[in-house]
């Protein structure tokens, strides 16, 4: 049920031990009683007791102290449950039997007579505290108190409320005295079923299933679920939003695992040639003469340059190289001539020209013909005039470069440039790099292109040393020192040959 | 909403050609560079090529060098892979991707990926 109705009888006399018809009990009135607690009716009248009714064993004889009792036969106070709203108001007949049967069961034994009766009608909150009162009659007097409390798990003026706390699935809460939940430590919601994440998880990337946890949800990963987990392969690169790739300063490629600077980090050029990081590798080397390879790390043959004259033939030395030369030459290159026009030197139509009175000769040669008697066909390619990779084809008494994809010009010498399209903002400075173009920016502006106005201009405190030029970087904080000839570190604070004690990007 | 969507993968066998389309919507197609990347199962992804915004710029992974060509149309937004010689090794899922700016540095978003099977 939802309350209980408590009736506490606290002592009942009759002294003269009298029925209510006037007559006297023999030997003496065995006293037990009835209760009848209906719905409040301004006159009380019989029928059923609507809100319940309770009989006593026999309690004593003529005048008695009733005693608290809370088990077994006889308990006090008398209970009467009801599993229905409390309404507020009520009726209570209280009636005083004599018995002269058994004292457990009164009610069943034939011969019971009326002693007294009270009525009482009236209102009665829900509530702790009893009710005292007391009736009586000529013959007799009753006194009682009484109350209306809620059963376990019903709270309410009406104990209409039903709360019950648990710690499961479904809930986690005590009862407040008005039915109302208190939530165990951890727990939130309506019903106390939601529980309170680690302080900080993340509201979006982050849930729980149980207090103090944090579960992050795919994309994301941290203590508190606020960092996101870049794209699967991202070498140099972070993200701000899940499975992003954003490469590091200096990094290129879909997934940053190509280093813009290579030439810096890696120093792949051998033998004093130039790199430049640029070309399909992120890197190209221009070799000094006598190199070559991908690195210029190849010696090329001494002959490679074809230093003899006039058809001689050329053998490789240890360190240097000799001439053989043909009949009518000598020298080192095989420069002079023991010929003279007499002999017809001049091939392929040269006509010859003496010099120093008869004793040598020069041939002027015809188109496409060189060599000291004009015995070469000219070769327009052999001066490798094509840069940047570009094909040399020769097209009779012309050649032509075939440009490799990105290159353009006679020798395929300018790029096809990303800077074409001014991508730089604020006057910035366009560097067309393999993977795209990077600008440096003036002083006061930053970002990719230069978009980003600094309010706190980096370079503005003078912050590199020796004549260096200051740049801003990326962020609004970061500068970058240029340094003079002579002087290396990150703010070219320091003569080279006095190296830093700590790494540093030039 | 950017969207790539590839498509043109495929059943080939060894020695065989494939081209692949990647078609763009959703932001200014030639302002951005577009690439190619692959995954085989239980193995890494590996970035295979890309072109930068002007189509000035492409590179390519030496594993895929002299096979593969990239090209894109910035007129129909779309952007091709022509794979020739195929091998068993190239199967894989292929995405196209873009890292949202003119130069190949990163990935910002990517398709949904086709299947190419090359099996004799």
């Known amino acids: 049920g939802s309350g209980i109705f408590q009736l506490r009888l606290q002592e009942f006399v009759n002294q003269r031990g009298m029925l209510a018809n006037g007559q006297s009990c023999e030997p003496g009135c065995r006293t037990f009683f009835r209760i009848c607690l209906k719905h409040f009716q301004a006159t009380f009248s019989e029928g059923p007791c609507t809100f319940g009714n309770v009989s006593t064993p026999v309690l004593g004889t003529n005048s008695f102290v009733v005693r608290d009792k809370n088990s077994g036969s006889g308990r006090n106070p008398l209970q009467l449950p009801f599993n229905f709203t409390w309404p507020g108001t009520f009726s209570l007949n209280i009636q005083a039997w004599h018995t002269p049967g058994d004292d457990l069961r009164p009610e069943t034994s034939p011969g019971n007579s009326l002693i007294s009766q009270i009525i009482i009608q009236g209102s009665l909150a829900v509530g702790k505290i009893w009710r005292t009162d007391e009736q009586n009659d000529t013959l007799t007097r009753l006194s009682y108190s009484y109350r209306v409390i809620c059963s376990d798990n019903y709270y309410g003026e009406s104990c209409s409320r039903l709360c019950k706390k648990r710690d499961d699935h479904f809930g986690h809460y005590e009862c407040q005295p008005d039915g109302s939940l208190s939530c165990l430590p951890g727990w939130t919601g309506k019903y106390c079923d939601q529980p309170i994440c680690l302080s900080g998880c993340h509201e979006q990337n982050g849930y729980c299933s149980k207090p103090d946890e944090c579960i992050c949800r795919p994309g994301w990963q941290g203590r508190l679920c606020n960092e996101c987990i870049p794209h699967n392969g991202c070498r140099h690169g972070t993200c701000s939003i899940p499975w992003q790739c954003a490469c590091d300063e200096g990094w290129g490629g879909l997934f940053c695992d190509q280093d813009l600077n290579y030439c810096t980090h890696h120093s792949p050029c051998k033998n004093g040639s130039t790199c430049s990081n640029s070309g399909p590798k992120g890197y190209t080397c221009t070799c000094l003469p006598g190199y070559t390879g991908e690195h210029c790390e190849l010696g090329l043959s001494k002959c490679a340059s074809n230093p003899c004259r006039n058809g001689g033939s050329c053998k490789d030395q240890e360190n240097s190289y000799h001439c053989l030369c043909p009949p009518g030459y000598y020298g080192q290159h095989c420069e002079h001539s023991t010929l003279t026009c007499a002999d017809s030197p001049c091939f392929n139509g040269g006509s010859c020209r003496e010099r120093n009175q008869g004793s040598s000769y020069a041939c002027e040669c015809p188109p496409n013909f060189t060599g000291s008697n004009c015995e070469k066909k000219v070769d327009r390619c052999t001066s490798n005039p094509c840069a940047n990779g570009g094909q040399c084809q020769n097209r009779g008494p012309s050649r032509t470069c075939r440009c490799r994809p990105g290159f353009t010009g006679t020798h395929c010498e300018l790029h096809i440039s990303d800077c074409a399209r001014s991508p730089c903002a604020h006057g910035g400075t366009c560097h067309d790099l393999e993977n795209g173009p990077v600008c440096t920016c003036p002083a006061g502006f930053s970002g990719r292109r230069c978009e980003v106005r600094i309010t706190h201009d980096a370079c503005a405190s003078g912050p590199c040393f020796n004549g260096a030029t200051c740049y801003t970087g990326l962020s609004p904080n970061n500068f970058v020192c240029n340094c003079p000839y002579g002087f290396v570190g990150s703010r070219c604070e320091f003569p080279v040959g006095l190296p830093p004690s700590f790494p540093w990007v030039a | 909403e950017v969207q790539l969507v590839e498509s043109g993968g495929g059943l080939v066998q060894p020695g065989g050609s494939l081209r692949l389309s990647c078609a763009a919507s959703?932001?200014?197609?030639?302002?951005?560079?577009i690439g190619w990347f692959r995954q085989a199962p239980g193995k890494e992804p590996e970035g295979i090529s890309c072109?930068?915004?002007?189509?000035?710029?492409?590179y390519y992974a030496d594993s895929v060098k002299g096979r593969f060509t990239t090209s894109r149309d910035n007129a129909k937004n779309t952007v091709y892979l022509q794979m020739n010689s195929l091998k068993p090794e190239d199967t894989a899922v292929y995405y196209c991707?873009?890292?949202?700016?003119?130069?190949?540095?990163?990935?910002?978003?990517t398709g949904q990926g086709t299947q190419v099977t090359v099996s004799s």
């Open positions: 072109i930068s915004s002007s189509g000035g710029i492409t």
């Open positions: 991707a873009t890292p949202g700016i003119a130069a190949c540095r990163g990935i910002h978003y």
């Open positions: 959703g932001f200014t197609f030639d302002d951005y560079a």
